[in-house]
């Protein structure tokens, strides 16, 4: 058929429209945010005109008085739900908390991402208040933590409804007892981290990384998972926006791979498999009241009553339309044309949609493709500032401005940061430390055996796409004998305080080193101490890199082991052995780089890489296969994605961004002591 | 301590209206919601609805809409519900109870008796 | 209007474990969040559970409670006689709540 022009407008079946006229959005908004009373502005006799310069000032818009378009866009962006003038009505006391150690529980999950995802935001969310404050904020698991947590839609048990997809977001009320300090968050809308749906992966050679979306396949765009260079028809991603370069990929949620929950332990489905007498080749809600999809793991249930419940496809899982909650069916036919991926082909609003069956024009079933969603941990910063007592903020670039914005630069605007201090003053200057004690060592985590799925191997990869080795980058000779060039500092305009995200952190000797980008800094514990540097790396270490992933010192041996992508140099003294490849450590080819490591008793460490690790012996320089395990088994409530793990006066640091969080060992227990900022908490830099 | 103090029983001709008073004590009454819960002879428990004592906002069920009324008077620390064109099979025990993510306090019962 | 079941009636021994499912019949009572409670002849409710597994202070540790796709469940180890009551699950659908029909647990 010739392809439709894109004046080709359809009227979709189920397309929720609004039909409030801009006056009648004006006056819900003005007083639904504090800018009018009750029924005061009801009525086109009524001038708008005062509330409007209001809400002008207090937004930083132009202040015409006027329902001009400025005002109406900001009208119509997603944004907090609390009031900008007036309160959540009028609570009692002065609304602040009075004690600095807050606690925190999650009250129940949105499906949006998985769960360590959004235990992961919360925490990072708090940490940026802790950062610039006293206060603290420990997760507890009861409704008596100060702050409570939930996801609800609607009308949620609080008097104040949330209102369906986008528009109210999130709301707050300030601190106090009961509901006073809780954060409520729309369950509507689309939670990510503000880049699209989090897909989580498993196998491949990513390490369980979510998926990219979109990327790149042979040429071609995807914004979902596909089975396009398969024959086995699993579902895979790439986990980088360019599968033909970097060849980094996972398999997504798919029942063909595994099933939850159910009796079945997890089997993948077999298809067909027959249940009351009829054979069924995908999984279905028959049978169910509750809608929830399932299969039989066997050829028949009748017979073997073996089940499980199929995983949800967050990539392709379409919201509104007249089909919410089911896939998107690639391809599909419209107006006599194939899709494979989502379309605005139809729409005048340039939203993305697709079929949920093969063909559009006979069964009329659609629903819109998943959007960048929003960022928990944004919206959750802003939520948590309310919960302590700020306001919003007519700053449009400060984290309390009203208006959802997405950014990945560091959140907090000096106007938070003011506002916050206000109420609670500044973070307490560290004390001089006294004499550290030596706690136990993290114990041998428990022998984990990966298993694989039966019909995948876990270094399988897409069949098609290049498969040529990783790159590494052009390293010097290696080179015996000490170096003779001295370690001078350069300017010192280059100052650690200055680095937002370090390389590699190791404690050598009893000082802390920090790398980055061919340099490097020495760091002394002691009041009123800076780091020393940055020296050259090169000159200290010839053989090195410029860019490392993780370093650590072996006590015993004095042994340097320095990580960089899938190679690894050993120094002692100012001798080197390597570069040599990770599988001669034992480490398999789906093991990408060395994120960390930690000391495990005598002579042996914990190497890590990603969300894994395994016990080291540094003297047979081997790890031990058997003793694989995953990094939140052994040390909950740490990020998932840390960039480096080390060692520092015998606590393990798990480094995120700009922030660490700190693991004291104690009896076996590993457990999160404090959250704070690597230049501020570790390095003392002064934080204005 | 934190309690919930419900007024006495009633007896009410059908079609008349009856305003059962509910007073808290031992927290802040308007950190909190109150739900009103009710309790026919011999059945299960009915959710009549909730107000959040902190904005005075309702949420009624759909069952009872046009019928109930819930109301607040946070000088008292008091909660009021209100149901009108009382039929015989409104007759229950009628609960108020604080209402933070899951109902914790509850008060004595109210019976209301329907009867012409 | 969700309806919520439950089976009206369970029974023990003393010592005995006693499991009350809890299943929603058009609504997905595994995204929500359930609450139980107890009540005794003659008195109010109490609350036993909230958020499908904590147990407020006060209530014995033999009380636990899960939540599972469509099921929730609570279950009570160690029956004792004063565990005598019924029992109801609670959980929120669009914007209302509702409550299971009960469960009488007989203690033999």
């Known amino acids: 058929a010739p392809r439709q022009r894109q004046s080709t407008l359809v009227l979709f079946p189920g397309d929720l429209r609004t039909n409030l006229t801009d006056r009648q959005l004006a006056e819900e908004y003005l007083y639904r945010y504090g800018y009018t009373r009750v029924a005061e502005m009801r009525g086109e006799s009524k001038s708008l005109g005062p509330a409007l310069l209001l809400l002008q000032k207090q937004l930083s818009l132009p202040e015409t008085g006027e329902l001009d378009s400025a005002t109406l866009k900001a009208m119509r962006t997603p944004r907090c739900g609390v009031p900008d003038l007036g309160r959540f009505q009028t609570f009692e006391g002065d609304l602040k908390w009075h004690h600095h150690n807050i606690t925190y529980w999650i009250q129940n999950y949105s499906e949006d991402l998985p769960r360590a995802v959004i235990d992961d935001a919360f925490a990072r969310a708090f940490a940026l208040w802790s950062a610039v404050t006293p206060l603290t904020f420990t997760r507890v698991y009861s409704r008596d933590a100060d702050i409570v947590i939930q996801f609800g839609v609607a009308e949620h048990g609080d008097g104040y409804p949330f209102d369906g997809k986008d528009g109210l977001l999130a709301h707050a009320f300030p601190p106090g007892p009961g509901i006073q300090g809780d954060a409520h968050f729309d369950d509507d809308e689309l939670w990510s981290l503000g880049k699209g749906v989090v897909v989580p992966t498993r196998f491949g050679n990513a390490d369980g990384a979510a998926c990219h979306f979109p990327f790149i396949f042979e040429g071609r765009s995807y914004s979902a998972c596909t089975t396009d260079g398969r024959s086995d028809g699993l579902p895979w991603c790439s986990t980088t926006a360019n599968y033909d370069t970097d060849d980094r990929f996972g398999f997504c949620p798919s029942e063909r791979l595994y099933t939850q929950d159910g009796n079945a332990d997890g089997k993948p489905c077999q298809f067909p498999f027959i249940f009351q007498g009829q054979s069924y080749s995908a999984c279905t809600t028959d049978g169910r009241s509750d809608g929830y999809r399932w299969c039989a793991t066997t050829a028949n249930y009748d017979r073997d009553k073996l089940f499980g419940f199929c995983p949800t496809r967050a990539d392709s899982t379409v919201m509104g339309g007249n089909s919410a909650g089911e896939l998107c069916v690639f391809p599909f036919t419209f107006l006599g044309k194939e899709y494979s991926t989502c379309t605005s082909e139809g729409r005048g609003d340039g939203r993305l949609w697709c079929a949920t069956t093969s063909n559009f024009d006979s069964d009329k079933k659609w629903g819109f493709c998943p959007d960048q969603g929003y960022s928990l941990f944004l919206v959750a910063a802003h939520e948590f500032g309310h919960a302590l007592g700020l306001d919003h903020s007519s700053v449009p670039e400060a984290l309390m401005y009203p208006m959802y914005r997405f950014t990945e630069g560091p959140p907090l605007h000096k106007d938070d940061v003011n506002g916050i201090r206000h109420l609670y003053g500044p973070r307490p200057e560290p004390e001089p430390r006294p004499p550290t004690t030596t706690t136990p060592q993290p114990t041998a985590p428990p022998t984990v055996c990966p298993t694989g799925p039966p019909t995948v191997h876990p270094s399988e990869r897409p069949t098609a796409g290049p498969t040529g080795p990783p790159s590494a980058g052009p390293t010097g000779p290696p080179t015996a004998g000490p170096s003779t060039a001295t370690t001078v500092p350069l300017s010192p305009v280059d100052d650690a305080c200055n680095v937002n995200i370090f390389d590699a952190i190791a404690e050598i000797g009893n000082q802390l080193y920090l790398f980055k980008d061919g340099k490097y800094w020495r760091f002394s514990e002691g009041r009123g101490s800076r780091p020393q540097g940055p020296f050259l790396i090169a000159d200290k270490w010839p053989a090195l890199p410029r860019k490392l992933d993780s370093v650590f010192e072996e006590r015993l041996s004095k042994k340097l082991f320095f990580f960089s992508g899938r190679q690894v140099w050993v120094y002692t003294g100012a001798s080197v052995l390597g570069p040599r490849r990770l599988d001669k450590l034992g480490l398999g080819a789906d093991v990408a780089q060395v994120t960390g490591a930690l000391r495990s008793g005598r002579g042996k460490m914990l190497l890590f890489s990603g969300r894994r690790l395994w016990r080291f012996d540094v003297k047979a320089q081997m790890v031990d296969p058997r003793s694989a395990s995953e990094v939140d088994r052994m040390f909950p409530g740490v990020p998932l994605d840390t960039h480096d793990v080390f060692q520092y006066r015998e606590k393990a640091y798990f480094c995120q961004d700009r922030f660490y969080w700190r693991v004291s060992s104690r009896s076996e227990l590993n457990q999160v002591d404090q959250v704070g900022y690597v230049t501020y908490d570790i390095l003392q830099c002064p934080e204005d | 301590e934190v309690q919930l103090v419900q007024s006495g029983a009633e007896v009410k001709k059908p079609g008349a209206s009856v305003k059962v008073s509910c007073k808290a004590s031992?927290?802040?009454?308007?950190?909190?919601?109150i739900s009103w819960v009710r309790q026919a002879p011999g059945q299960g428990l009915e959710w009549m609805g909730y107000i959040s004592a902190y904005n005075a906002n309702t949420n009624y069920a759909q069952k009872l809409q046009g019928r109930v009324t819930m109301t607040t008077d946070t000088s008292t620390s008091t909660a009021y519900m209100e149901l009108r064109s009382l039929r015989s099979d409104d007759t229950a025990v009628y609960y108020c109870?604080?209402?933070?993510?899951?109902?914790?306090?509850w008060g004595q019962g109210t019976t209301v008796t329907v009867s012409s | 209007q969700a309806v919520l079941t439950q089976p009206p009636s369970a029974s023990g021994t003393p010592g005995q474990r006693v499991t009350i499912s809890c299943s929603g019949s058009?609504?997905?009572?595994?995204?929500?969040?359930v609450n139980w409670y107890q009540q005794l002849p003659g008195t109010a409710p109490k609350l036993l559970i909230y958020?499908?597994?904590h147990r407020p202070s006060g209530v014995p540790d033999r009380f636990s409670g899960s939540n599972s796709w469509n099921t929730a469940s609570l279950a009570i180890s160690g029956l004792q006689s004063e565990d005598e009551a019924d029992y109801y699950c609670?959980?929120?659908?669009?914007?209302?709540?509702?409550f299971g029909g009960g469960t009488k647990v007989t203690v033999l």
């Open positions: 058009t609504f997905n009572i595994g995204s929500n969040t």
């Open positions: 031992g927290y802040t009454f308007t950190s909190y919601g």
């Open positions: 109870a604080r209402d933070y993510y899951g109902m914790d306090v």
């Open positions: 609670q959980a929120w659908d669009s914007s209302a709540v509702v």
């Open positions: 958020s499908d597994s």
